[in-house]
């Protein structure tokens, strides 16, 4: 099956973070090139990354059209310099990807603490609302726009002098927590989509501590 020098792609893998979505596969081509096709379950195939020697293809533009759809991709192998050549069945060799539903499966990117402000014994911590490549009415949507209340943030906060991490949760991008007067605290946030069964958590944000430039302190 296939022409003498052509091998089918294998290990097709979706790599997706905050909807930036790339299909990767093996092997590195030797005397062959690849073309990728993508479709929804009910849709037509659309070709991307024509006759490439890469082993990845950015499919973001296609999946952001409807992130709740389930997508399937396939990678075709052609002999280099003879892309009209087909396999023994009259078709070029191809391999199917696993199905991919961006809304359920895209990894949550590392969040960033935008700011924190202390007023007396309260601290307001704000998480940056990261922009995605999902568009609506010609504007890019934020992570919160896309996921709405499905997305929560978990805040870990602790006294600089201790190791135990307290937690708070929000389905906005802001936390208001109680702190002890005169104590310095450190903060880290994690994005979570509790309704998922996989890829529920992001990596933790960089740790930010009071007394550093991101914060603001006001004694009341």
């Amino acid at each position: 099956s296939g022409t003498t020098n052509t091998v089918a792609a294998y290990n097709l893998t979706w790599k997706s973070t905050n909807f930036k979505t790339i299909l990767e596969w093996e092997p590195k081509p030797v005397n062959q090139v690849y073309t990728v096709q993508i479709s929804t379950k009910s849709g037509d195939w659309k070709s991307k990354c024509f006759y490439t020697t890469d082993t990845e293809c950015d499919l973001t533009d296609e999946i952001v059209k409807d992130v709740k759809q389930t997508y399937l991709a396939r990678v075709f192998s052609y002999p280099a310099g003879n892309v009209e050549s087909t396999g023994s069945a009259g078709e070029p060799l191809y391999e199917n990807s696993p199905e991919f539903t961006p809304y359920l499966e895209t990894n949550l990117g590392q969040p960033t603490i935008q700011s924190f402000e202390q007023v007396g014994t309260k601290v307001n911590v704000t998480v940056e609302d990261e922009r995605t490549l999902v568009r609506r009415n010609n504007t890019f949507l934020s992570l919160r726009d896309v996921f709405g209340k499905d997305l929560i943030y978990t805040l870990y906060y602790w006294k600089s002098s201790s190791s135990g991490k307290k937690t708070a949760k929000t389905n906005t991008n802001e936390f208001l927590i109680d702190v002890d007067k005169g104590e310095n605290y450190c903060f880290s946030v994690q994005a979570v989509i509790p309704s998922r069964t996989v890829n529920r958590k992001s990596t933790d944000s960089p740790v930010e501590c009071m007394g550093q430039e991101k914060g603001e302190f006001r004694e009341i």
Epitope: Q190, S195, K201
Partner: antibody
Framework: EVQLVESGGGLVQPGGSLRLSCAAS????????IHWVRQAPGKGLEWVGF????????YHADSVEGRFTISADTSKNTAYLQMNSLRAEDTAVYYC?????????????WGQGTLVTVSS | DIQMTQSPSSLSASVGDRVTITCRAS??????VAWYQQKPGKAPKLLIY???FLYSGVPSRFSGSRSGTDFTLTISSLQPEDFATYYC?????????FGQGTKVEIK
């Protein structure tokens, strides 16, 4: 099917140590949080502490701080409670529970418990 | 830490009775309150989450409500399998805390 199974309980002398295990199946612990809760004989529920196995972050109740340590081995899908300097008042059934992690739901699945008796 | 004061500590009731258990939080906990049922020798089971939502598989005779920092668990018509101990719990702040429990016994 989600399951949590505790083990490692038993009789130990005051000042001794014990390590409890909480083996999870039906879900991946690094996607959730694991809590330990204990119940002294004939008494109510007392929260002991939690771990986020994804990053190793923990918090322990004041009553066990410095004596108990919660850890996790994600490759074994198991959480642990290391108990040192045990006292008679630590005698209890120890439960591990899964934290669903939403604003609304916290401890949705519990293990069957393991009895720790501290006595000379 | 937030205290959850549960009352009564025990009550006697008959099958078919309407039973009400209350829990008062020492400060605002929003709706981050759960109710658990525990039978002797068994682990607690989640009944109500977010103050008033029935957990999956729990009979509809159980309900929860909130009024400020007061939380109520109601069993509309007590069944034989409902004789157990009930606990409230807040998870609004760390550490989460439980009420002292209410034992529902057969009259």
């Amino acid at each position: 099917e989600v399951q949590l199974v505790e083990s490692g309980g038993g009789l130990v002398q005051p000042g001794g140590s014990l390590r409890l295990s909480c083996a999870a199946s039906g879900f991946t612990i690094s996607d959730y949080w694991i809590h330990w809760v204990r119940q002294a004989p004939g008494k109510g529920l007392e929260w002991v502490g939690f771990i986020d196995p994804y990053n190793g972050y923990t918090y322990h109740a004041d009553s066990v701080e410095g004596r108990f340590t919660i850890s996790a081995d994600t490759s074994k899908n198991t959480a642990y409670l290391q108990m040192n300097s045990l006292r008679a008042e630590d005698t209890a059934v120890y439960y591990c529970a899964r934290d669903y992690g939403s604003l609304q739901v916290q401890l949705d699945y519990w293990g069957q418990g393991t009895l720790v008796t501290v006595s000379s | 830490d937030i205290q959850m004061t549960q009352s009564p500590s025990s009550l006697s009731a008959s099958v078919g009775d309407r039973v009400t258990i209350t829990c008062r939080a020492s400060q605002d906990v929003n709706t981050a309150v759960a109710w658990y049922q525990q039978k002797p020798g068994k682990a607690p089971k989640l009944l109500i989450y977010s103050a008033s939502f029935l957990y999956s598989g729990v009979p509809s005779r159980f309900s929860g409500s909130r009024s400020g920092t007061d939380f109520t668990l109601t069993i509309s018509s007590l069944q034989p399998e409902d004789f157990a101990t009930y606990y409230c719990q807040q998870h609004y702040t760390t550490p989460p805390t439980f009420g002292q429990g209410t034992k529902v016994e057969i009259k």
